[in-house]
């Protein structure tokens, strides 16, 4: 089963995916795609990294975290209802059948109509959000607490701060990290 994440129309969506490089700068190719992870690759690829850099991306899809440290979490800008669905994060570890793959389900909710237009709930990084722990059975889930309301002026900086926040550590501690080597 897929791990579920939520965002509202017009916001940015955040889909976490991490691995731990065997050594600093010793990167592993990663792809993100729309659709469940197939046997190879990432369905319809929206972003890809190689051993050095992001070498393919499409508009609205980017890596905000430090991918050189293994944070390959995907940000989707300004989501619409059409962005709902399953996304695949695939960590393409060299060798014989070594790939690690994760299916993440993104649910887009219509924007809330609120009387105070300067306040916005459920920015993409808002919770509750479900995280998977590694394993071969049905996904185990963990719910993280809700973030406080976020002022619109803070939204643009929140994503940049996210990777350095306790949230990023919580994600890693939850078992969403793959260690390579």
């Amino acid at each position: 089963s897929e791990v579920e994440y939520r965002a509202e129309v017009g916001q940015n969506a955040y889909l976490p995916c991490f691995y731990t490089p065997a050594a600093p700068g010793n990167l592993v190719p990663v792809c993100w795609g729309k659709g469940a992870c197939p046997v190879f690759e990432c369905g319809n690829v929206v972003l890809r990294t190689d051993e050095r850099d992001v070498n393919y991306w499409t508009s609205r899809y980017w890596l905000n975290g430090d991918f050189r440290k293994g944070d390959v979490s995907l940000t989707i800008e300004n989501v619409t209802l059409a962005d709902s669905g399953i996304y695949c994060c695939r960590i393409q570890i060299p060798g014989i059948m070594n790939d690690e793959k994760f299916n993440l389900k993104l649910v887009i909710k219509p924007a809330k109509v609120t009387p105070a237009p300067t306040r916005q709930r459920d920015f993409t990084a808002a919770f509750p959000r479900m995280l998977t722990t590694r394993g071969h059975g049905p996904a185990e889930t963990q719910t993280l607490g809700s973030l406080p309301d976020i002022n619109l002026t803070q939204i643009s900086t929140l994503a940049n701060e996210l990777r350095d926040s306790r949230l990023a550590n919580d994600l890693r501690d939850s078992g969403a990290t793959i260690r390579i080597g």
Partner: antibody
Amino acid sequence: EVQLVESGGGLVQPGGSLRLSCAASGFTFSDYYMAWVRQAPGKGLEWVANINYDGSSTYYLDSLKSRFTISRDNAKNSLYLQMNSLRAEDTAVYYCARDVGYYGGNYGFAYWGQGTLVTVSS
Amino acid sequence: DIQMTQSPSSLSASVGDRVTITCRASDNIYSYLAWYQQKPGKAPKLLVYNAKTLAEGVPSRFSGSGSGTDFTLTISSLQPEDFATYYCQQHYGSPLTFGQGTKLEIK
């Protein structure tokens, strides 16, 4: 025009080895995963192995991975299958096939070679 | 392993008939399914990929549908050149697996 041409098949004794080759042309070889699929006489199709763009990742049918090795040489636009410790049940036509490309999307073996027959018999 | 089961195993039909072949996966494969046509002594030919997308050069009388576990290949009006064996194949789980084939014969 996309072309895949297999070679290297033939008669081999049980326990012997054989190396199949597939010469590709008409497309950017390094942009595609490649595969070997086999078909025993009068039987259905069976996937054997796949290899990614640069050869760093390989995928095998579990029962074959200790004996078969898939590899590629992008400079020569060539795909290979090294088969060791061959058994009678490995007798089949072996096809080289082009699989999914660099941007994903099309999941199916879009192009196939004509096949090369491997016969394992004493 | 994901098992792919085709039905029927063989089928007799006439030119002009509408024919449907089904393929069932033992697990959810989303839309990662392909259909192939094979004639005796020849390599398989891709007809449909991603469950419903027609491969380049394939006549429009062929169509694919389904997702999840149940899939169909339909030939809307059989032509003489369509008599062959048809295989489904999943691209979702390893190992890649094929159905056992459906032999389409002239009635």
